[in-house]
């Protein structure tokens, strides 16, 4: 109770009371002091006596404490994908008896839902409400409507507002759990078929067969097939077990194999399902190609005269395919070039670039040439090799080695002498000239003898026909 100070300038004090008069109530000196923050209702009882009659005992005085903020309470809720739910107590509650009775109590939407809308039951359904009255909530006219998107959660924030007494609630957030619904059918996006070798087993690549579904994972997209007309479908790791279903996830993992049997052109009919919706009547085409085999004939040995140029010929190198491929499409690649000379093209003789590719047709035309480069040291016979790779897609590549034999023993039209040097001699008329090693050198005959033993040997020139216009 408020009691005045003894002196005029002394401030009034607050004293707890056991009794008070009607006059004290009338003058506003009896106060209720709220001291427990979370307790919003209270009561006390009185015995009222006037001195005239029997006192009134146990008069109950009930108190409602008005919180500083409107006590708006929220409860999270679930809604099916694309579904709706009425926002009514107990999902949305203003506790206590006082605030819900205020005519001006309204709710403001501070943050609207991202994947849905707050709508009035009978109002326009275009967009979300920005505010609505508590009366509408009580009459169950406000609902949350999910937009049907493939989202698992949504949220919105509300704040209560009592305009007539300038009070508000704290912002209250609602979390909406969206229960997914399998409402989207699977769509076959790619069905290009498969090309493979006859009799082979090959994966059905995801690039050849793919489907999508907005609300199903790849492991839930199931292809169910009928009898393939030219083979069998098996899973990697179980080639002996034929299967009639596989998933997009298995295709993505390269686990679905087609094993070809029978006709070259065929495939299988299939249906596509996500467990809820089925898309029937599809066909996956499997086209098998007969294996093209490359073969290499010819001696694969080239005999070259020292220091000369020799064309490769069909006797040396002759490629063909089981499909009768055009020689222009039989391609050789030089994997490792010659060590003792060079390979070049007759029409594109550039001394710089080494020849890397040539065709069988060019071999037939005699346009691929091997040129032997004379070494500084004499030799009788030398061996070179060329490593080639024959290719003609779609056949498998074939490796080939071309052996080159460079020998003084061979009959060489470009080089009549078998000797390392036999240049002949220029002699002025009536005079003499020295025959030196620069003009006549048969040391290549000793090239096969190991160096340490060469001193034990010598080359003997025996004159079988003497000069007729001079003498040795």
């Amino acid at each position: 109770m408020v009691s005045r100070g003894a002196l005029a300038d002394e401030p009034p004090s607050l004293d707890p009371v056991q009794s008070f008069s009607q006059e004290a109530v009338d003058t506003g000196r009896v106060l209720y002091l709220h001291s427990r923050p979370e307790a919003w209702s209270d009561a006390f009882s009185l015995d009222v006596a006037s001195g005239l009659g029997a006192p009134l005992e146990g008069v109950l005085v009930e108190l409602e404490v008005l919180p500083a903020a409107i006590p708006l309470e929220a409860q999270n809720f679930s809604v099916p994908e694309g579904g709706s739910l009425t926002l009514a107590p107990p999902l949305l509650r203003v506790s206590g008896p006082y605030f819900p009775t205020l005519l001006g109590l309204s709710l403001q939407v501070l943050e609207p839902p991202q994947h849905g809308a707050l709508q009035k039951e009978d109002g326009p359904q275009a967009r979300t409400l920005s505010a609505f009255s508590w009366r509408m909530v009580e009459e169950q006219l406000i609902r949350y409507v999910h937009d049907g998107s493939e989202t698992l959660t949504d949220s919105f924030v509300l704040m209560a507002n009592a305009s007539e007494m300038d009070r508000q609630s704290h912002p209250v957030a609602f979390t909406v759990t969206v229960l997914p619904v399998n409402d989207q059918p699977p769509i076959l996006t790619t069905n290009t078929g498969l090309q493979m070798w006859e009799g082979a087993t090959a994966p059905i690549p995801a690039e050849a067969l793919r489907s999508t579904d907005g609300d199903s994972g790849s492991e839930d997209l199931v292809y169910t097939i009928e009898q393939p007309s030219n083979g069998r479908v098996v899973l990697r790791g179980a080639p002996g077990t034929e299967v009639r279903s596989f998933t997009q996830a298995q295709l993505d993992g390269g686990l679905v194999l087609f094993s070809h049997r029978g006709t070259l052109d065929g495939g299988f009919r299939f249906r596509l399902s996500d467990g809820e919706h089925t898309s029937p009547g599809h066909f996956f085409r499997v086209t098998a190609q007969k294996q093209v085999l490359l073969s290499l004939k010819g001696s694969q040995t080239l005999t070259v005269c020292p220091g000369s140029v020799q064309p490769l010929s069909s006797q040396t190198l002759r490629a063909s395919s089981s499909a009768g491929t055009d020689p222009q499409l039989l391609l050789y690649r030089v994997v490792r070039g010659p060590q003792l000379g060079r390979l070049f093209h007759a029409q594109q003789d550039s001394t710089g670039e080494a020849l890397v590719n040539f065709t069988q047709a060019e071999v037939y035309a005699g346009n691929i040439l091997y040129e032997h480069e004379m070494p500084p040291e004499p030799f009788w016979e030398a061996h070179d090799t060329l490593e080639l790779q024959l290719s003609s897609p779609p056949a498998r590549d074939v490796a080939a080695t071309l052996a080159v034999a460079v020998s003084f023993e061979a009959a060489c039209p470009q080089r009549p002498s078998h000797l390392w040097k036999n240049k002949g001699l220029w002699v002025p008329e009536g005079q003499r000239a020295r025959i030196t090693v620069a003009a006549l050198d048969a040391s290549n005959l000793l090239a096969s003898v190991p160096s340490p033993q060469r001193s034990e040997h010598d080359v003997l020139f025996q004159v079988t026909q003497f000069p007729s216009r001079g003498q040795l």
Partner: antibody, heavy 113, light 107 residues
Framework: QVQLVQSGPEVKKPGASVKISCKAS????????MHWVKKAPGQGLKWLGW????????TYADDFKGRFTITLDTSARTVYLEISSLRSEDTATYFC??????WGQGTLLTVSS | EIVLTQSPATLSVSPGETVTLSCRAS??????LHWYQQKSGLSPRLLIK???DSISGIPARFSGSGSGTDYTLTINSVEPEDEGIYYC?????????FGQGTKLEIK
């Protein structure tokens, strides 16, 4: 309409061979696999094997590998089940079926000495 | 091979009752499961294919459900002519296999 007609009942001695036929009509024969099922007295259905009617490739259940052979005559639209070295336990009704729905009427094979 | 286990082995019900037959596979069979009814001396009759697809000419009281490894055949308001043995068949991978069967008796 679709029909699978099987050959008539057979009575054979142990050690002999038998060839049961199943003739299809009313659909594209090479579109659907043909299966054989065994139903022995007092027992359930047992899947025996099937043949790919497009490729002619048969597949057998483990219990039926060896003495059982499934073959095909595409021009006659007929599938055959041949059982060699017959035993008394081969006594049963053998059904052919195609694409789940279509079943033959069954062929009763009795193996008895 | 995939093993199919049917339950119960035998079932005795009165006309009008609803019956649920179960078929469990030893691994996922991607709904490649078909239900058959066989009456004594007759060929099996397809009731449901691919787990839940209905068959024309089969009464609507027969329905199928399930996925993965667990499948169910439901017969609503059983009739006396429904007596027989019911088999499930998996057609997912070779060898195809039947369940051991459920015998349905009508009281």
């Amino acid at each position: 309409q679709v029909q699978l007609v099987q050959s008539g009942p057979e009575v054979k001695k142990p050690g002999a061979s038998v060839k049961i036929s199943c003739k299809a009509s009313g659909y594209t024969f090479t579109d659907y696999s043909m299966h054989w099922v065994k139903k022995a007295p007092g027992q359930g259905l047992k899947w025996l094997g099937w043949i790919n009617t497009a490729t002619g490739e048969p597949t057998y259940a483990d219990d039926f590998k060896g003495r059982f052979t499934i073959t095909l005559d595409t021009s006659a639209r007929t599938v055959y089940l041949e059982i060699s070295s017959l035993r008394s336990e081969d006594t049963a009704t053998y059904f052919c079926f195609s694409y789940y729905d279509y079943w033959g009427q069954g062929t009763l094979l009795t193996v008895s000495s | 091979e995939i093993v199919l286990t049917q339950s119960p082995a035998t079932l005795s019900v009165s006309p009008g009752e609803t019956v649920t037959l179960s078929c469990r596979a030893s691994q996922t069979i991607y709904k490649n499961l078909h239900w058959y009814q066989q009456k004594s001396g007759l060929s099996p009759r397809l009731l449901i294919k691919y787990g839940s697809d209905s068959i024309s000419g089969i009464p609507a009281r027969f329905s199928g459900s399930g996925s993965g490894t667990d499948y169910t055949l439901t017969i609503n308001s059983v009739e006396p002519e429904d007596e027989g043995i019911y088999y499930c068949l998996q057609g997912y991978s070779t060898p195809w296999t039947f369940g051991q069967g459920t015998k349905l008796e009508i009281k």
